[in-house]
Amino acid sequence: IVLRPSRVHNSEENTMRALTLKDILNGTFSYKTFFPNWISGQEYLHQSADNNIVLYNIETGQSYTILSNRTMKSVNASNYGLSPDRQFVYLESDYSKLWRYSYTATYYIYDLSNGEFVRGNELPRPIQYLCWSPVGSKLAYVYQNNIYLKQRPGDPPFQITFNGRENKIFNGIPDWVYEEEMLATKYALWWSPNGKFLAYAEFNDTDIPVIAYSYYGDEQYPRTINIPYPKAGAKNPVVRIFIIDTTYPAYVGPQEVPVPAMIASSDYYFSWLTWVTDERVCLQWLKRVQNVSVLSICDFREDWQTWDCPKTQEHIEESRTGWAGGFFVSTPVFSYDAISYYKIFSDKDGYKHIHYIKDTVENAIQITSGKWEAINIFRVTQDSLFYSSNEFEEYPGRRNIYRISIGSYPPSKKCVTCHLRKERCQYYTASFSDYAKYYALVCYGPGIPISTLHDGRTDQEIKILEENKELENALKNIQLPKEEIKKLEVDEITLWYKMILPPQFDRSKKYPLLIQVYGGPCSQSVRSVFAVNWISYLASKEGMVIALVDGRGTAFQGDKLLYAVYRKLGVYEVEDQITAVRKFIEMGFIDEKRIAIWGWSYGGYVSSLALASGTGLFKCGIAVAPVSSWEYYASVYTERFMGLPTKDDNLEHYKNSTVMARAEYFRNVDYLLIHGTADDNVHFQNSAQIAKALVNAQVDFQAMWYSDQNHGLSGLSTNHLYTHMTHFLKQCFSLSD
């Protein structure tokens, strides 16, 4: 199925031009999305083009500037947050990135009622995390790994924790591994719905081994970056959850929430916290061997001022075929009775679906079913449940938004988005106002992205929030590649692929093929989304065919495919890429002497293994920031899929699945190895070990390092990287410069 037809007609050909690498590096064809910052059922904030913060009321149609760009500019604010009582706005400046989600910043509080900044008892700097209470204008913030509370922005702070210490004890913020692999947030504190209580996590990293690497900077001596980072099998952080009454914080102080006995008996993780009411909280825990998860509902005991988590309110989720959940264990969405909830987990047929849990998981009522997967529950109201899935027309790489009426029996299902802009929009996300009175739909493609506002009752479109008209006009004279999404059926496995074809593609001709691979567990590369990126340029200007293939281990097609790689990383992902390449050759338009593969991170691992598979299929390939041995990667991620690197568990496959073990097989391919020296995530160590193994095997290869760059290789490094990779591929494919 052709998703993005190129608008090329003979008469137009001379006015149309191909994409250039410069277009890509300059972000010439980037798109905009519009996510309303909802502040009520019918109001949202949005930063205007001239940087005023504007409040929009959908029902009255009125809008006014709540915060002037003059105020934003006076502190060089790059972000803001309105207090729920609308009295104050925090302004964030001096943004300083730490890891994937975390950053520090300076915060200023602007008093909207008095039209001036709050002076006195100002916030310290830099702050690691800051947030308003859900009601009123209390502030919680983390400074130097300790949590502080202010009843009002101008009040003196109350210090909640005192044991915070850099790289040792983290309060209210995650350590490296929890941030990257478990919480996927920069914070680890949660206000109760009305701001009565504040829950927070304490992470103790005292016994975790430290990864140390040089940061070269500009000084005479490099500095050493030290990060407590548990690699597979190493000592993990110790986590504790506390809750404090923010009305009288000094009265009893923080109270620890007990860990379920079946979890506490061995190493475990805390995976998420969900407040149900001000006096009921839901915690999710996970065994270190990540196939058992426990959801624990705890209640506040007024008489003892403690939190009680009865065994009758413990719900166990266990996987017998893989790990618990998808990438993460799903989180519950509670219904109005404050005890029952909706949750996505595998059904008996091995597809992730929405279930309704009233008393026990065993008695769960299945809400959705079919050979497709429910992906996200957006909102549950009194009468509707909104979720996304890839059910429509059986394309796993699509996302549509559905509404299930839970107020009526039997519940009826309606696809909200399936027929809205069918050709343009097949991949949606949504953002809901309070009580789902209104919602925004953000369509990511396959056509040019568009964001729209809708009535939550009737689903009627109210207005277009962003339609990327400028982008549409800019692309009118560009020869975009054609894209198609299809599937291969091989040995009872369905391999979905996306093929990006040159604008004047002719099936009777032969084209060089580049495979772009990620392939990590629970990932998906074949998605119906719009993108004008490096591979678009390679197809448009350099005449390459690019293919992305979702093989075993990838997501949203059922547990059989997902859990196929359990305890066996680096085998089937590679096999499936190779199988797909063979199928592509059979299609007749691929020059089998000019096939390359490239990937980043997990994709760098897969591309390296594919190059070293000994098949002779690949002429060359690139690995950017690859994992080279699972013993070098983070415990939480690695052990989820591989178990432990111990003799009595899975050490043998840890050893067999390294890139280094296949060093000899790189002899007959051109290999470009690339890594940032300050990669906190996939450590430079991984590429250093590949390089050492290749040198020891006397195998020639090319390499590029990026000094002081992390896993993202951002800024000027990005330009250098893509220019360098382009030269490498053009040389490999004998394309003139």
């Epitope: 409040l55 006014y64 500037t65 709540i66 002037s68 003059r70 105020t71 006076s74 502190v75 609308r86 009295q87 200023y108 008093d111 909207l112 009622s113 008095n114 039209g115 001036e116 900044f117 709050v118 002076r119 006195g120 101008g154």
Partner: antibody, heavy 124, light 113 residues
Framework: QVQLVQSGAEVKKPGASVKVSCKTS????????IHWVRQAPGQRLEWIGG????????NYNDKFKGRVTITVDTSASTAYMELSSLRSEDTAVYYC?????????????????WGQGTLVTVSS | DIVMTQSPDSLAVSLGERATINCKSS????????????LAWYQQKPGQPPKLLIF???TRESGVPDRFSGSGFGTDFTLTISSLQAEDVAVYYC?????????FGQGTKVEIK
């Protein structure tokens, strides 16, 4: 010349409410917040609260919270202060005053123009 | 809340003589970021609203005679009338606008001796 003109004197019974208006002119209404200050006989000036006409957001002195409501009508460039559950000790002259909005981080302004005052007498 | 205390409560000065009023705040009104003191002085004559004389502790409001001057920083401030005139008979108030609630001193009554 900038003007803040307040409504006339009021006599109220205990438990009643009073609403005082402050009509402004000859300046840009939305460039200033409006504040209310009272002065009981022989007492110091006492700040009641203020409001930002741009967003209609009020700020009240905790002492008056629950009893005072400050509002604005931007189209009429007028601010209002309503005080409920009146008691004899609320007998005072009530003033409105303007204060320039501080957009910048280093700004901060005093109340530069005041209304003529409204005498509110609470007596049974 | 910041408490403002003025001294003396009343002051009688001969015409042409200097009058000095002190004002003390319970916490510093000096803002470290701009080194400004958030203190104002007002003059109130009988039956009239207060009139702004001085802001930022020492900056004269336009139209205010230069015999009025303000000084001090942090917690201690002074209003000086260098040469008292008959029309200066009034009650003078200091006020902090450093933080909310805004608070005033109890006032100093200036009379002619």
């Amino acid at each position: 010349q900038v003007q803040l003109v307040q409504s006339g004197a009021e006599v109220k019974k205990p438990g009643a409410s009073v609403k005082v208006s402050c009509k402004t002119s000859r300046y840009t209404f939305t460039e200033y917040t409006i504040h209310w200050v009272r002065q009981a006989p022989g007492q110091r000036l006492e700040w009641i609260g203020g409001i930002n006409p741009n967003n209609g957001i009020p700020n009240y002195n905790d002492k008056f919270k629950g009893r005072v409501t400050i509002t604005v009508d931007t189209s009429a460039s007028t601010a209002y202060m309503e005080l409920s559950s009146l008691r004899s000790e609320d007998t005072a002259v009530y003033y409105c005053a303007r204060r320039r909005i501080a957009y910048g981080y280093d700004e901060g302004h005093a109340m530069d123009y005041w209304g003529q005052g409204t005498l509110v007498t609470v007596s049974s | 809340d910041i408490v403002m205390t003025q001294s003396p409560d009343s002051l009688a000065v001969s015409l042409g003589e200097r009058a000095t009023i002190n004002c003390k705040s319970s916490q510093s009104l000096l803002y470290s970021r701009n080194q400004k003191n958030y203190l104002a002085w007002y003059q109130q004559k009988p039956g009239q609203p207060p009139k702004l004389l001085i802001f930022w502790a020492s900056t004269r409001e336009s139209g205010v005679p230069d015999r009025f001057s303000g000084s001090g920083f942090g917690t201690d401030f002074t209003l000086t009338i260098s040469s008292l005139q008959a029309e200066d008979v009034a009650v003078y108030y200091c006020q902090q606008y450093f933080s909310y609630p805004l608070t005033f001193g109890q006032g100093t009554k200036v009379e002619i001796k």
